[in-house]
């Protein structure tokens, strides 16, 4: 008789999830010499241990502590790029500006990027059928708690000028409910961080508005200022040109405002 299985509103665990995590770990540790000491089997065991046999609506940050410990990594604290709703461009940027890091350029972020996972209470099975949706089911699900945990730690590590890339095409350029707005902003350490620098990325070719004056950006400035951190903002009117000029600042097309 088939066992009754909880049906959640979100997509199930990414197919070949264990193999994917293990393969990503091996690849990452091969490419990054400072992480060569990491035992990827132990990493997978700790990852699995965070959610297997646990109710997928009852996951805590504590569940992920063994994984966090194994994935401890030092990135230059003044070279951190946060992002909100504009992941692809942020990743393109750090692929060119190799000394800057998004969360997904760290081991733990790289392992989990774009993946979904959850287990079931009291069984060692991974649920490939469905996983809890943050809104429709519960917020303390394995994926959400993972990203909340690693995002908090990443923000806590930042120093000097912290950069954040924001999507100027969204109705809420700064969204208080995003991971950036709900976790990272509140975990920057004022004794280490002097300034939060926002880059507002324009979508439209002819969009010459100053989106740094957007009400949601002013809201972000207010939150940051209250935390005793300075705030600055820059419009990136031509993201394609911006990337090109990061690659080669001496290029003749880089002689005008970006």
């Amino acid at each position: 008789v088939p066992r009754w299985r909880q049906q959640w509103s979100g997509p199930g665990t990414t197919k070949r999830f264990p193999e994917t995590v293990l393969a990503r770990c091996v690849k990452y540790t091969e490419i990054h010499p400072e992480m060569r000491h990491v035992d990827c089997q132990s990493v997978w065991d700790a990852f699995k241990g965070a959610f297997i046999s646990k109710h997928p609506c009852n996951i805590t940050e504590e569940d992920y502590q063994p994984l966090m410990k194994l994935g401890t990594q030092t990135v230059p604290c003044n070279k951190i790029l946060l992002w909100s709703r504009i992941k692809d461009l942020a990743h393109q940027f750090t692929q060119v500006q190799r000394d800057m890091f998004t969360l997904e350029d760290t081991l733990l972020g790289y392992l989990a990027d774009d993946l979904t996972w959850c287990g079931e209470f009291n069984t060692s099975k991974i649920n490939y059928q469905s996983c809890p949706d943050w809104r429709k089911d519960c917020s303390n699900n394995p994926v959400s708690v993972f990203w909340k945990t690693v995002s908090r730690r990443f923000a806590e590590a930042a120093c000097d000028v912290v950069h954040v890339m924001l999507n100027g095409s969204r109705s809420k350029i700064f969204d208080k409910n995003s991971t950036f707005g709900s976790v990272e902003v509140h975990n920057l350490q004022p004794e280490k961080v002097q300034t939060l620098e926002a880059w507002v990325i324009h979508g439209g070719r002819e969009d010459s508005r100053d989106l740094c004056q957007d009400p949601t950006i002013k809201e972000l400035e207010s939150i940051i200022s209250k935390r005793n951190i300075q705030f600055s903002c820059k419009n990136i009117y031509r993201p394609d040109k911006f990337l090109q000029c990061v690659k080669n600042p001496e290029d003749s097309s880089c002689t005008s405002e970006i």
């Epitope: 003044n78 070279k79 800057m100 000097d160 000028v161 950069h163 002097q194 300034t195 620098e197 926002a198 880059w199 300075q230 600055s232 903002c233 820059k234 000029c245 990061v246 600042p249 880089c254 002689t255 005008s256 405002e257 970006i258």
Partner: nanobody
Framework: QVKLQESGGRLVQPGGSLRLSCAAS????????MAWFRQGPGKEREFVAA???????LYADFVKGRFTISRDNAKNTVYLQMNSLKPEDTAVYYC????????????????WGQGTQVTVSS
């Protein structure tokens, strides 16, 4: 190529003020982070302050509250306003530029001026 020229250095009494200027030419100034470094007699070159292309500022702990960095993109110039000067601020002050992002490490700046001498003495 970015060319940088500092000015404004001179002899000043302890407790006095000074404004250094650094004029840039050759590239789009507004796309560059600008910084001030200094090198005292027999000392290593050290970071003083920086301002990014987005006007983010960054200061060394020893100058916080005394020095202010600012930029005027229309004039292609970066300034260092120095108040409450102390004898230990005596050094050659250098202006430096790098693409976009403000950092502390001198090795990460591609372009440098020749420097201007600041002497704080009574």
């Amino acid at each position: 190529q970015v060319k940088l020229q500092e000015s404004g250095g001179r002899l000043v009494q302890p407790g006095g003020s000074l404004r250094l200027s650094c004029a840039a030419s050759g590239r789009t100034f507004s796309n560059y982070a600008m910084a001030w470094f200094r090198q005292g007699p027999g000392k290593e070159r050290e970071f003083v302050a920086a301002i990014s292309a987005a006007d983010s500022t960054l200061y060394a702990d020893f100058v916080k509250g005394r020095f202010t960095i600012s930029r005027d993109n229309a004039k292609n110039t970066v300034y260092l306003q120095m108040n409450s000067l102390k004898p230990e601020d005596t050094a050659v002050y250098y202006c430096a530029a790098r693409w976009w992002i403000a950092v502390r490490a001198p090795a990460e700046y591609n372009y440098w001026g020749q420097g201007t001498q600041v002497t704080v003495s009574s």
